[in-house]
Interface confidence: medium
């Protein structure tokens, strides 16, 4: 599963700032559905100490609440552990720090283990482009064309940016 | 760096099918993903198709279901299959490659683009 996926070169820094989250997957659909634990959408990233720190929003009630989040590396450079309903081992699978950020989470919550990606970009008007990359992704990891559910501007929290 | 030399481009007509080929050649082993992007005169660049060293395919929403990516890597090839071609797919079609996570933009390989016209 993280065979394809290595030693990524350069700074996390290059991270850092505001992202747009535009698609999810899983293999449980119930977890990226509205009201599922991981139908979350990322705001804003930094990182420090080779941590990962993360802004996400996440609906509630018809609104959209801000939660901190920090995802601490490992002894693997691509590789951070973050919890969050849970334990997840979260992979960087595929970034380009200008461009887009493909991550996928294995997720381990009361006995059960499940696989959550996510496609974010810096530019919403781009993000046709990387879908096709998010689908190869995917399908590297064991998820099918048809558990990716590709976000809409309602969806997103767009009003809850600043 | 890895190079990447197409070929397979021409003039068909509307229905008809063409194969694109993209070798590869250099730092191979690095590869973690292949594709095709496709620009037409005055137009942005569209992301066609890619796949991964894993297998796995993506396709943009305009060719879904027309063209097929297969990768050969025993050869180092990378193939992108077009069939019932129509007059909009007419573009300058541009094979790349990127290296394995964490991929960026600056090294990102390309090859020089082979021409693809339907036309009647």
């Known amino acids: 599963q993280e065979g394809n996926h290595e030693e990524p070169q350069g700074g996390l820094e290059e991270l850092s700032g505001r992202w747009h989250s535009v698609a999810l997957a899983s293999n449980k659909s119930d977890l990226i559905k509205p009201w599922g634990h991981f139908r979350v959408f990322i705001h804003s990233m930094s990182a420090k100490d080779g941590n990962l720190h993360g802004d996400i929003l996440i609906p509630q009630d018809g609104q959209c609440e801000k939660v901190s989040l920090t995802a601490f590396k490992t002894a693997t450079s691509n590789k951070f552990d973050l919890e969050y309903w849970g334990h997840n081992d979260l992979y960087l699978a595929e970034v380009d720090p200008k461009s887009y950020l493909i991550l996928y989470m294995i997720n381990q919550y009361n006995d059960d283990t499940s696989l959550v990606a996510h496609l974010m970009v810096r530019d919403l008007s781009r993000q046709q482009d990387f879908l096709p990359a998010f689908e190869s992704v995917c399908e590297d990891i064991g998820l099918h064309k048809d558990q990716i559910v590709v976000l809409s501007d309602d969806d997103r929290c767009q009003g809850s940016r600043d | 760096q890895v190079q990447l030399v197409e070929s397979g481009g021409g003039l068909v007509q509307p229905g008809e099918s063409l194969r694109l080929s993209c070798a590869a050649s250099?730092?191979?082993?690095?590869?973690?993903?292949m594709g095709w992007y496709r620009q037409a005169p005055g137009e942005q660049r569209e992301h066609v198709a890619t796949v991964t060293s894993g297998g796995g395919t993506g396709y943009a929403d305009s060719v879904k279901g027309r063209f097929t990516i297969y990768r050969d890597n025993a050869k180092n090839t990378v193939y992108l299959q077009m069939n019932s071609l129509k007059p909009e797919d007419t573009a300058v079609y541009s094979c790349y490659a990127i290296p394995k996570s964490w991929s960026r933009t600056s090294e990102y390989s390309w090859g020089q683009g082979t021409q693809v016209t339907v036309s009647s």
């Open positions: 250099g730092s191979i082993f690095s590869i973690y993903r």
